[in-house]
């Protein structure tokens, strides 16, 4: 299995001046997808730091793909960043901080955080993986940064989250996630394998988010969840490219590498985007 043949590499800080991105998907390389259509789309090029045209095949690909130059600029360039500057004045919390926690209508059980306006604190809840509302954060820290008051009653953000352009979308976009790995793929890639309710024994693959690999399982033929693929390739394509590896500025990380990585300095963190 070539997936196991990974060399270890020491990656250190880079000399690029800081590039502040509003969304991590802006760092993805242009992906035309496997289909054969010829569709003019735009992507954010992390090297030129501009939105550029590319030809999209019409299916799959990734989120660094926009219908227009304007939309690309709006989502990925710094001029349009929704910045909340640290100040001695009382900052307004975003409206969504006052929404009650909402698990959404789906059945995944993903740990998320919401701001509880009663206790004035960020708290953990179980998110189903779809819909719900925007009072939904991947980390406690991100929730605190955006919704909690600082020690003096001030907001603590220096860079606010520019939420997904889609209101109440599947996964609110985050700009600050201190964990080593951040997931930007479909949320069901994080759900466990689910055999389902029937009696068949079909060979399927699911994405194991703990080990970051696609693994076989036996599917019963009905029910289950969406972390269910007919081939390993389909599973990898859907789920593996969602992971972005993070490291703090000036830090050192021993990381597994299979293919050449693009390197880009983003805000005060480096993001290594795997070429899938």
């Amino acid at each position: 299995d070539s997936e196991e043949d990974e060399e270890h590499t020491i990656i250190t800080d880079t000399e690029l001046p800081p590039l502040k991105l509003m969304h991590s998907f802006c760092a993805f390389k242009a992906d035309d997808g496997p289909c054969k259509a010829i569709m003019k789309r735009f992507f954010f090029n992390i090297f030129t730091r501009q939105c550029e045209e590319f030809i999209y095949g019409g299916c799959e690909g990734n989120q660094n793909r926009f219908e227009s130059l304007e939309e690309c600029k709006k989502m990925c360039t710094r001029d349009n960043a929704n910045r909340i500057i640290k100040t001695t004045l009382q900052q307004e919390k975003p409206d969504f901080c006052f929404l009650e926690e909402d698990p959404g209508i789906c059945r995944g059980y993903i740990t998320r955080y919401f701001y509880n306006n009663q206790t004035k604190q960020c708290e953990r809840f179980k998110y189903g993986g779809c819909l719900g509302n925007m009072n939904n954060f991947e980390t406690l820290e991100e929730c605190k940064n955006i919704c909690e008051d600082g020690p003096n009653g001030f907001q603590v953000d220096n860079y606010g989250t520019q939420l997904n352009a889609v209101n109440n979308s599947l996964t609110p976009q985050s700009t600050k996630v201190p964990s080593l790995f951040e997931f930007h793929g479909p949320s069901w890639c994080l759900t466990p394998a689910d055999r389902g309710l029937c009696r068949a024994n079909e060979n399927r693959f699911y994405y194991n988010s703990v080990i970051g690999k696609c693994r076989p399982f036996k599917y019963s033929g009905c029910g289950g969840n969406e972390n269910n693929f007919t081939s390993k390739q389909e599973c990898l394509r859907a789920c593996k490219k969602g992971f972005i590896q993070r490291i703090s500025k000036g830090g050192l990380i021993k990381t597994k590498r299979k293919r050449k990585k693009q390197r880009v300095k983003i805000a005060y963190e480096e993001i290594f985007v795997k070429n899938m």
Epitope: Q63, I105, C106, C130, N167, N168, S169, L170
Partner: antibody
Framework: QVQLQQSGPGLVKPSQTLSLTCAIS??????????WGWIRQSPGRGLEWLGI?????????HYAVSVKSRITINPDTSKNQFSLQLNSVTPEDTAVYYC???????????WGQGTLVTVSS | DIQMTQSPSSLSASVGDRVTITCRAS??????LAWYQQKPGKAPKLLIY???SLQSGVPSRFSGSGSGTDFTLTISSLQPEDFAVYYC?????????FGQGTKVEIK
């Protein structure tokens, strides 16, 4: 096999309240892996989602902005059903109303038979 | 709100034909899309969910593809019972919205 059976009047006068009920068999209204919604269909508007309720240790709801001030969807756990109330109706609310179940993946996999509601004096 | 636009609004085809219906979302909805079939006087029936997953009990001649903003429903070999209206629906964000429908008629 899940089945949804709708009931309620087919004629409602303008300014009155439209009330429909959806009786569930083969599932529970308080299931923690389903959600229950109302959708209507009219020639002018096509399929229009009105709202949804679901139970995840407590009840949640979401309503379409176009009807938010007039709509209530309530569960009745004792009868294993849920209802739609739409206040202050006008002829614009004339449509076929469907109740539906949204399954674990968030899509409507079971639908009621539909009720044509006409708003007219 | 996310607008869903289907094309064509109607098409004529013969039994055995390969039929393709497209649905475009006004913004990126990843693969949060379903396809429904509706016959006169009946409720819609779920065919495809998550853009490409076949709902249990639906014939394999139905398939879905696409991601982001552009989606396709394909009927590989049209059968007499497939003449109906087909709708797409996004589940990416509230309010849930449907396409205006594509009527598949007998040529």
């Amino acid at each position: 096999q899940v089945q949804l059976q709708q009931s309620g009047p087919g004629l409602v006068k303008p300014s009155q309240t439209l009330s429909l009920t959806c009786a569930i068999s083969g599932d529970s209204v308080s299931s923690n892996s389903a959600a229950w919604g109302w959708i209507r269909q009219s020639p002018g508007r096509g399929l229009e989602w009105l709202g949804i309720i679901y139970y995840r240790s407590k009840w949640y709801n979401h309503y379409a902005v176009s009807v938010k001030s007039r709509i209530t969807i309530n569960p009745d756990t004792s009868k294993n059903q849920f209802s739609l109330q739409l206040n202050s109706v006008t002829p614009e609310d004339t449509a076929v109303y469907y109740c539906a179940r949204s399954n674990w993946s968030g899509y409507f996999d079971y639908w009621g038979q539909g009720t044509l509601v006409t708003v007219s004096s | 709100d996310i607008q869903m636009t289907q094309s064509p609004s109607s098409l004529s085809a013969s039994v055995g034909d390969r039929v393709t219906i497209t649905c475009r979302a006004s913004q990126d909805i990843r693969n949060n899309l379903a396809w429904y079939q509706q016959k006169p006087g009946k409720a819609p029936k779920l065919l495809i969910y998550a853009a490409s997953s076949l709902q249990s009990g639906v014939p394999s001649r139905f398939s879905g593809s696409g991601s982001g903003t552009d989606f396709t429903l394909t009927i590989s070999s049209l059968q007499p019972e497939d003449f109906a209206v087909y709708y797409c629906q996004q589940r990416n964000g509230f309010p849930l919205t449907f396409g205006q429908g594509t009527k598949v008629e007998i040529k």
